[in-house]
């Protein structure tokens, strides 16, 4: 497979969508069985990420 995608985790907190920055505003990748404070997007969920989010450049 083509190696892919920068995760580009920002250094400041408060944005939407990335690792420890997941907050109540993020509307995607949530499991219905989860509360809004424990998103399925959290890497600790153990789910496998897309090839786009696999590698840092």
């Amino acid at each position: 497979p083509i190696s892919a995608f920068a995760v580009d985790i920002p250094e400041t907190h408060g944005g939407e969508g990335y690792e420890d920055e997941i907050d109540d505003e993020y509307e995607g990748d949530w499991s219905n069985s989860s509360s809004s404070t424990s998103g399925a997007g959290d890497p600790s969920s153990g789910k496998e990420k897309s090839w786009l989010y696999t590698l840092d450049p």
Epitope: D8, E16, G17, G28, K47, K49, S50, Y53
Partner: antibody
């Protein structure tokens, strides 16, 4: 509410060019990777291009060198510049937001027809 | 490229019936599979991600599972709005590849 609205589709002759746009709202656009996917007249879905938050780009072999994905983080707009268009590029083109588990929100699509 | 073979291509079923759609991956993709729903007007919505996680707002009659290289979308009791098109998507490796789709029709 996450919203993605594509525009710019139309009828173009083989060998011609077209630029599609996708206006994003309801989320912090710069914080997400974005992709383009197309659906052929036979209803087959095909990945077209992806762009990272830092504007690193990815393409399948079928469009590499002909299509260019780009983004305007200030204006919350995703683009797809298509050139050297072929009849097989005829499709409905969708933009989609990316997250850990691939495309989580999709636009309504814009139609591209390549015909003489 | 990873090939996703989706079956059946069309399925006729009745309201209240339980149905399952399947995608078979040509290579190992782990749990990296989504199910998408497409309305007649072209609107595409993700129903399930990571094989079995339900997206927010998706009715609980939808569920996803895996057995080896076979991935299934099950609708426990069909409702009228479920008679649309469904696609699987693998995101394990580039390029993204999709199943050929299943058209769910009312009997």
């Amino acid at each position: 509410e996450v919203k993605l609205v594509e525009s710019g589709g139309g009828l173009v002759k083989p060998g011609g060019s077209l630029k599609l746009s996708c206006a994003a709202s309801g989320f912090t656009f710069s914080s997400y990777a974005m992709s383009w996917v197309r659906q052929t007249p036979e209803k087959r879905l095909e990945w077209v291009a992806s762009i990272s938050r830092g504007s690193i780009t990815y393409y399948p072999d079928s469009v590499k060198g002909r299509f260019t994905i780009s983004r305007d983080n200030a204006g919350n707009i995703l683009y797809l510049q298509m050139s050297s268009l072929r009849s097989e590029d005829t499709a409905m083109y969708y933009c989609a937001r990316e997250y850990y588990y691939a495309m989580d929100y999709w636009g309504q699509g814009t139609s591209v027809t390549v015909s003489s | 490229d990873i090939q996703m073979t989706q079956s059946p291509s069309s399925l006729s079923a009745s309201l209240g019936e339980r149905v399952s759609l399947t995608c078979r991956a040509s290579q190992d993709i782990g749990s990296r599979l989504n199910w998408l729903q497409q309305e007649p007007d072209g609107t595409i919505k993700r129903l399930i991600y990571a094989t079995s996680s339900l997206d927010s707002g998706v009715p609980k009659r939808f569920s996803g599972s895996r057995s080896g290289s076979d991935y299934s979308l099950t609708i426990s009791s069909l409702e009228s709005e479920d008679f649309v098109d469904y696609y699987c998507l693998q995101y394990a490796s580039s390029p993204y590849t999709f199943g050929g789709g299943t058209k769910l029709e009312i009997k």
